[in-house]
Amino acid sequence: DAHKSEVAHRFKDLGEENFKALVLIAFAQYLQQCPFEDHVKLVNEVTEFAKTCVADESAENCDKSLHTLFGDKLCTVATLRETYGEMADCCAKQEPERNECFLQHKDDNPNLPRLVRPEVDVMCTAFHDNEETFLKKYLYEIARRHPYFYAPELLFFAKRYKAAFTECCQAADKAACLLPKLDELRDEGKASSAKQRLKCASLQKFGERAFKAWAVARLSQRFPKAEFAEVSKLVTDLTKVHTECCHGDLLECADDRADLAKYICENQDSISSKLKECCEKPLLEKSHCIAEVENDEMPADLPSLAADFVESKDVCKNYAEAKDVFLGMFLYEYARRHPDYSVVLLLRLAKTYETTLEKCCAAADPHECYAKVFDEFKPLVEEPQNLIKQNCELFEQLGEYKFQNALLVRYTKKVPQVSTPTLVEVSRNLGKVGSKCCKHPEAKRMPCAEDYLSVVLNQLCVLHEKTPVSDRVTKCCTESLVNRRPCFSALEVDETYVPKEFNAETFTFHADICTLSEKERQIKKQTALVELVKHKPKATKEQLKAVMDDFAAFVEKCCKADDKETCFAEEGKKLVAASQAALGL
């Protein structure tokens, strides 16, 4: 679809409000360190320029591509070299290399201060004084901290953020109304960011085919009544949307996502019976709702899979004619019958089936060769089932905090070279699988748990990629997307690791720990636990438990003391000495 002016076309199709919001998100995701005011200025300049192109598409520079226009604008930032270092070299390149260069410099862990929530009255005053600036600031702060956040979904979060302030700033008890809503948005936002990060990693590191396979499996589980052709069409459209967003093409992405939501709702009769409620909602809510919709019921009397994929004499002929289509049909048929399997398990089964056909269709007797292919699936299915059973039992026994601690120890022993903050963050998130998934019945546990673990392990992979320190992490992250979790599960204690030097400063605590929230206090204790394991990787569970129990008692005691700081200083020395003795340091 060629247009005289791409920027005018997008501005008219999206409207001024969406255009400005999406350009702000795009710029903040690229230049994560730039001050808010600088970004607003850049966005306003781009918007004014776009309006001149709307008025006259033949005006100067209106024929330039969006990447050229946006890249040129980003490259006008005066402090690019000082603030971003080698990212400034991107500006010497031509499109499309310049945009690729910007994408490569997106930072998953930018060095930005933690967002501190002001008092409710302060926030409400700011909201009432200038609602537009207040909401722009929200987009900016989230986008720069989450450079792969799904832009059209961020518009939805901003809409909810605005609604929360509109409602709660008029309430009798503003804080009671607002704070739970902000907590919910923060937690949902982190989860949304992590899920999208996996989609982008899948596309960028493993290619479109890998993403499409994931989408076929997931959409087939969700829409088991839809025909294969319908699922294929949805997969193609969804792949385009996510390719655009992950590539920084946020205007196209948002518009195409809206088109996809419209298509799904206009064709819901041939897609799913569960879409009715979603399709009655406004656009942003509708798109979100469709993305989260529950699986439709499986059609009754689905025939056995073996007939078409094992028993048929045409298996190799059908495979040879169109390999990816045939494998796609296999994945579709298997997934629609198995909402109880994780997507990654379904992809492992499809990969096993593909490998078997590659080998057997070249054999003397292909049918004899692949006749038992479904038997190869059994151990692949049982491995995650057993793992989830064991870990849910452990979670129920320990509770979330202690379950997280067990995982902290487990993962620190596997990959002790990884930075302590990363190990704490990832292990805490791995531990949340318990409360998230173990409450579900058996039929829902695996898709919940293993697909969630894929998202969390991707966080480890992208953080580790920035500063690689462990060959084992690199290997598990890069060899196979669907086997990441089994790869990490299979890692034993790293025997090559040289224990970290003991540093008393690491285990010195102060009275400020007493004023921290329960979550922050847990993080402090879990940070200490990781450091302990790094000093003494061969420490037993019992030894570590004893030290951690002593540590908890020490914190509790000193936080009750009159002179807290003195208590932390004196009792802290004793604790360090006792811990060293207990661990034989």
Partner: nanobody
């Protein structure tokens, strides 16, 4: 939720004028971009004009540019469409719509009125 009610339609001779109004009730009118769309018999619904929530940006379909003017009065919660130099091909049901953004595409509008009939005779 926003409720939209159009008025001002009617029968007019070619070359004449009409002013359509759209009264909004419910959620804050000023929080929405607004648009006018129309649908002639046996034809697809088509975009006419849009106005941003601040009122600072307006955009028109080529077929009405220079003849129609969209405006809004946030104090009165009302959207207007001033239609001059009307032509027989302007005959249609005119719909007012509210949405997140001042787009020319109907998919970005979440709330719609019931429509008001405009008939231009030659």
């Amino acid at each position: 939720e926003v409720q939209l009610v159009e008025s001002g339609g009617g029968l007019v001779q070619a070359g004449g004028s009409l002013r359509l109004s759209c009264a909004a009730s419910g959620r804050a009118f000023s929080s929405y971009a607004m648009g006018w769309f129309r649908q002639a018999p046996r034809k697809e619904r088509e975009f006419v004009a849009t106005i941003s929530l601040s009122g600072g940006y307006t955009y028109y379909a080529d077929s009405v540019k220079g003849r129609f003017t969209i405006s809004r009065d946030n104090a009165k919660n009302t959207l207007y469409l001033q239609m001059n130099s009307l032509k027989p091909e302007d005959t249609a049901v005119y719909y007012c719509a509210a949405g997140e953004s001042s787009s020319r595409q109907d998919k970005w509008y979440d709330y719609w009125g019931q429509g008001t009939q405009v008939t231009v005779s030659s």
